[in-house]
């Protein structure tokens, strides 16, 4: 759970999840792009 991230603030936790979601989307797009270019 929480990938070892510890935070006492619920809003900070939500922010971390939002960042994680954004990075997953960006990295996912990059991966799809690389596959497409092959």
């Amino acid at each position: 759970h929480s990938d070892g991230i510890f935070t006492d603030s619920y809003s900070r936790y939500r922010k971390q999840m939002a960042v994680k979601k954004y990075l997953a989307a960006v990295l996912g797009k990059r991966y799809k792009q690389r596959v497409k270019n092959k």
Epitope: S9, Y10, S11, M17, K21, A24
Partner: antibody, heavy 117, light 112 residues
Framework: EVQLVQSGAEVKKPGSSVKVSCKAS????????MHWVRQAPGQGLEWMGL????????RYAQKFQGRVTITADESTSTAYMELSSLRSEDTAVYYC??????????WGQGTLVTVSS | DIVMTQSPDSLAVSLGERATINCKSS???????????LNWLQQKPGQPPKRLIY???TRESGVPDRFSGSGSGTDFTLTISSLQAEDVAVYYC?????????FGGGTKVEIK
């Protein structure tokens, strides 16, 4: 409008486990923070934990750490709360609730779990 | 954990009169994002709780304007300006700023 529908009442023996389900409709389940809160008969409310389904990321209340497991099935928009090593003090109504703006905007109807020998 | 202390435990008010419920937290609920995650819930017998107020003073849509929330830091108040028969319920404050999320003990509001 988000709707949360929970599984039916359960009667369990001390020492056993219970798994309560909560099916969401009318919203983006995967991108929601799904919480579980319980209420013992005639008592107040107690937060148990949450799950963020996209990453299956969980946070549990210290009191329930090691005894509660919250999971989610994105394909059916259903969250589950499993509580193990049940004792009589766990007799309560268990609610799921979805966060909006940092507070619980939508609640399930509640599931009564009775622990009795 | 943050301790949420509600007072009074119960309150009997005449129809049309004002009802005031207090809630005190053991630590400031002002978050780093500038918001105060103090919430008020209403619960009627046999029903799940219902959100009335969030961010200390923002009324949920559809909630009558006789309900208002105020306060900051550690001291908060829920006011029902003119009590109606349908307001008979238990009211809970709870904080969503810090883990573990915690609730007040509840205030039962009855008609005098």
């Amino acid at each position: 409008e988000v709707q949360l529908v929970q599984s039916g009442a359960e009667v369990k023996k001390p020492g056993s486990s219970v798994k309560v389900s909560c099916k969401a409709s009318g919203g983006t389940f995967s991108d929601s923070y799904m919480h579980w809160v319980r209420q013992a008969p005639g008592q107040g409310l107690e937060w148990m934990g949450l799950i963020y389904p996209i990453f299956a990321d969980t946070r549990y209340a210290q009191k329930f750490q090691g005894r509660v497991t919250i999971t989610a099935d994105e394909s059916t928009s259903t969250a589950y709360m499993e509580l193990s090593s049940l004792r009589s003090e766990d007799t309560a109504v268990y609610y799921c609730a979805i966060d909006q703006d940092g507070s619980f905007a939508y609640w399930g109807q509640g599931t009564l779990v009775t622990v009795s020998s | 954990d943050i301790v949420m202390t509600q007072s009074p435990d119960s309150l009997a008010v005449s129809l049309g009169e004002r009802a005031t419920i207090n809630c005190k937290s053991s630590q400031s609920l002002l978050d780093a994002d500038g918001k105060t995650y103090l919430n008020w819930l209403q619960q009627k017998p046999g029903q799940p709780p219902k959100r009335l107020i969030y961010w200390a003073s923002t009324r949920e849509s559809g909630v009558p304007d006789r309900f208002s929330g105020s306060g900051s830091g550690t001291d908060f108040t829920l006011t029902i300006s003119s009590l109606q028969a349908e307001d008979v319920a238990v009211y809970y404050c709870w904080q969503g700023t810090w883990f573990d999320l915690t609730f007040g003990g509840g205030t039962k509001v009855e008609i005098k």
